[in-house]
């Protein structure tokens, strides 16, 4: 969490950021709140992005003020108009690219003072993992699959009754290029895997980590997958 | 050659549903938004919804929030769109759109679209 | 939402003539202004991008032009086969609106 205050003249406001990550070709959500003023006509939001020349984003007297944007945010960006009033000035962008990492800045103009804050932005891809059957194999086998991941994952193996155990042995992952040519499928196989068990299949990077699990008895199959952004810290 | 088919038009009574698909082919499906945009019988025309290249981002206009559910299957190369409690206005020739690759919020592929009745 | 606006809704041309139809946004959105063709039984085709950006496999004689709320698609010298209908679109926001279009016909 960002706290930034505001400095000169006028007095201060607090602007408040979250460190987010966003998910290449989905849209993403840069968090950004501030004191709320009564009337919408005097709130100036701009976005800034370090490195680049033009604005991310301006909205001005209730509407979008888009001449000063740069090149590579044009058609992209958008704030939720009928809650700037209430001091949300919070960015929706709109199909993230790997390219739109980095450090922005919110900053706010009220009538009761100035404010901004920084905001880390991370892009990848990430995606939640099913684990199924591989009936195809010789031996009682688990698949696990996601279709999107960058920067490359681990994947490691973990089971209920075997905690701790190393599955390494008898596991086997393949990352394919998917056809943008950035993201990646994961598939990891595992080998020998016993009934009456539940096993996990986690894969990891330094944006996302997601667990897909798997509990195979006689009867029946249960699954579960669940995925977290790591790192995401307010400002 | 990019081609765009929709299917699964028809007549539907007021507080209907239905749901329309558009088979995508000649271009990587998984690298690019969609879109619906209507055309009604006065030739006006309405964007719909959007869906992301890979599914889990989707808008909507005010017109159709809560009714209508755009959705696609990459697996499939196809887009969907399930309309549902319909109204006569939604009454419109419906066309699935490629949206421009990266920016712009713009339409460079259009299907040749499939006709929606809303009528008693 | 922008409300674009174009004039005029009809415009009979001859061969030959260079037209300009017009597109208003209720508010500025920059170069954000696409247009589109639609011919009779057709679907409409992306003619112009970016206000002024040029289409591969449109011809030349289509060109686009304005910025902030004006913006014009000029058609140099009209051909039998330009008649039909021609929409701007607002890429400026992501509630994409469309004007109510032109009709192009021949006297």
């Known amino acids: 969490l960002i706290i930034g205050f505001g400095i000169s003249g006028r007095h201060s406001i607090t602007v408040t950021t979250v460190a987010s990550a966003g998910n290449i070709g989905e849209d993403g959500i840069l968090s950004c709140t501030f004191e709320p003023d009564i009337k919408l006509s005097d709130i100036v939001i701009q976005w800034l992005k370090e490195g680049v020349l033009g604005l991310v984003h301006e909205f001005k007297e209730g509407k979008d003020e888009l001449s000063e944007q740069d090149e590579m945010f044009r058609g992209r960006t958008a704030v939720f108009a009928d809650q700037v009033i209430v001091g949300n000035a919070s960015l929706r962008l709109k199909n993230v690219q790997l390219t739109d990492a980095g450090t922005y800045k919110c900053y706010i103009i009220t009538s009761k003072g100035k404010g901004n804050a920084n905001l880390e932005y991370k892009t990848g891809a990430f995606s939640m993992p099913e684990v199924n059957v591989d009936y195809n194999a010789s031996s009682e086998t688990l698949r696990c699959e996601a279709p999107r991941w960058f920067p490359q994952p681990t994947v490691v193996w973990a089971s209920q009754v075997d905690q701790g155990a190393n599955f390494s042995e008898v596991s086997n992952t393949s990352f394919e290029l998917n056809s943008e040519n950035v993201t990646m499928k994961v598939v990891s196989v595992l080998y020998n895997v016993t009934i009456n068990n539940t096993y996990s299949c986690m894969i990891e990077n330094d944006i996302a980590k997601a667990t897909g699990d798997i509990k195979v008895t006689e009867s029946e199959i249960k699954r579960r997958s669940h995925l977290q952004l790591l790192n995401s810290k307010a400002s | 050659e990019v081609q765009l088919v929709e299917s699964g038009g028809g007549l539907v009574q007021p507080g209907g549903s239905l749901k329309l698909s558009c088979a995508a082919s000649?271009?990587?499906?998984?690298?690019?938004?969609m879109s619906w945009v209507r055309q009604t019988p006065e030739k006006r025309l309405e964007w719909v919804a959007y869906?992301?290249?890979?599914?889990?981002?989707?808008y909507y206009s005010d017109s159709v929030k809560g009714r209508f559910t755009i959705s696609r299957d990459n697996a499939k190369n196809t887009l969907y769109l399930q309309m549902s409690s319909l109204k006569p206005e939604d009454t419109a020739m419906y066309y699935c759109t490629r949206e421009s690759y990266s920016q712009g919020n713009y339409f460079d592929y259009w299907g040749q679209g499939t006709t929606l009745t809303v009528s008693s | 939402d922008i409300v674009m606006t174009q004039s005029p809704a009809t415009l009979s041309v001859t061969p030959g003539d260079r037209v300009s139809l017009s597109c208003r946004a209720s508010?500025?959105?920059?170069?954000?202004l696409h247009w589109y063709q639609q011919k009779s039984h057709e679907s409409p085709r992306l003619l112009i991008k970016?206000?002024?950006q040029s289409i591969s496999g449109i011809p030349s004689r289509f060109s686009g032009s304005g910025s902030g709320s004006d913006f014009t698609l000029s058609i140099n010298s009209v051909e039998p086969e330009d008649v039909g209908v021609y929409y701007c679109q607002n890429g400026h926001s992501f509630s994409l609106t469309f004007g109510a279009g032109t009709k192009l016909e021949l006297k």
């Open positions: 508010q500025s959105i920059s170069d954000y």
């Open positions: 000649g271009f990587t499906f998984s690298n690019y938004y």
């Open positions: 970016f206000a002024s």
């Open positions: 869906v992301s290249s890979g599914g889990g981002s989707t």
